[in-house]
């Protein structure tokens, strides 16, 4: 099949990092400066991604690949690929269209990136909680009361494995 | 489990207007995308909105296209107007999760622009 195909379509022959050129009787021709292709038989080769301004070139383009960005630091990647970057506020905050904001209090946010989320509920899986949150840190859940009273067993069968309950927001 | 699903693609003249969905389950998701990729093209940014609403698209379709998304119902939403037929593409919603470390995907939906 591949050898009737490329009988039948010369451009089928031409290989990553060139195109096939209509203007010179389908001959391969390479990609021009800052353009690649990344597969065979392509009639045009794509222009290379340029990591301007906060976007930082992690990989440069190549003929077979195109470049790939990351961000400068204080800001983050977003998206596939780092489509965006977008300022870090500090653990314990999220940005907002007003800049960056302390959780709210009932959640918290680890990281410099990302949003607020709400504290685990020990409750529902019948724990009590043992460190409270904060807006930097989840809480910590431990045995239930009634696990700690005396006379109970000091082996507790483990807790069910859950999945989190969240939803999108 | 995360599950995006789109909906709302289809055949329209260029000048029209079509409403993009995106039903999302399973995550608190940070941000909210649409990318689109044209036959034989490279995937492209097209829009993001944040969960405290900030919303950034890209050049070509500035003005043209308005993202949205309804927190309560976990749909996420892009009006196209004045399409043209460079719109012509898969469109696909995409989300990070709430820290911004993973980028889940849609199946796509395709969109035709054509008289």
């Known amino acids: 099949f591949e050898r009737t195909r490329s009988l039948q379509d010369p451009c089928s022959n031409c290989p990553a990092g060139t195109f096939c050129d209509n203007n010179r009787n389908q001959i391969c021709s390479p990609c021009p400066p800052n353009s690649f292709s990344s597969a065979g038989g392509q009639r045009t080769c794509d222009i290379c991604r340029q990591c301007k301004g906060v976007f930082r070139t992690r990989k440069e383009c190549s003929s077979t690949s195109n470049a790939e960005c990351d961000c400068t630091p204080g800001f983050h990647c977003l998206g596939a690929g780092c489509s965006m970057c977008e300022q870090d506020c500090k653990q314990g905050q999220e940005l907002t269209k007003k800049g960056c904001k302390d959780c709210c209090f009932g959640t918290f946010n680890d990281q410099k990136r990302g949003i607020c989320r709400p504290w685990t509920n020990c409750s529902l899986d019948g724990k009590s909680v043992l460190v409270n949150g904060t807006k930097e840190r989840d809480v910590v859940c431990g045995p239930s009361p009634a696990d700690l009273s005396p006379g109970a067993s000091s082996v507790t069968p483990p807790a069910p494995a859950r999945e989190p309950g969240h939803s999108p927001q | 489990q995360v599950q995006l699903v789109e909906s709302g693609g289809g055949l329209v003249q260029p000048g029209g207007s079509l409403r993009l969905s995106c039903a999302a389950s399973?995550?608190?998701?940070?941000?909210m995308f649409w990318y689109r990729q044209a036959p034989g093209k490279q995937r492209e940014y097209v829009a993001h909105?944040?969960?405290?609403?900030?919303?950034n698209y890209a050049d070509s379709v500035t003005g043209r296209f308005t993202i949205s998304r309804d927190n309560n119902k976990n749909t996420l939403y892009l009006q196209m107007n004045s399409l043209r037929a460079e719109d012509t593409a898969v469109y696909y919603c995409?989300?990070?999760?709430?820290?911004?470390?993973?980028?889940?995907w849609g199946q796509g939906t395709l969109v035709t622009v054509s008289s």
């Open positions: 399973g995550d608190i998701f940070s941000i």
């Open positions: 995409a989300a990070d999760d709430a820290t911004n470390t993973r980028t889940y």
């Open positions: 909105i944040t969960s405290n609403g900030r919303t």
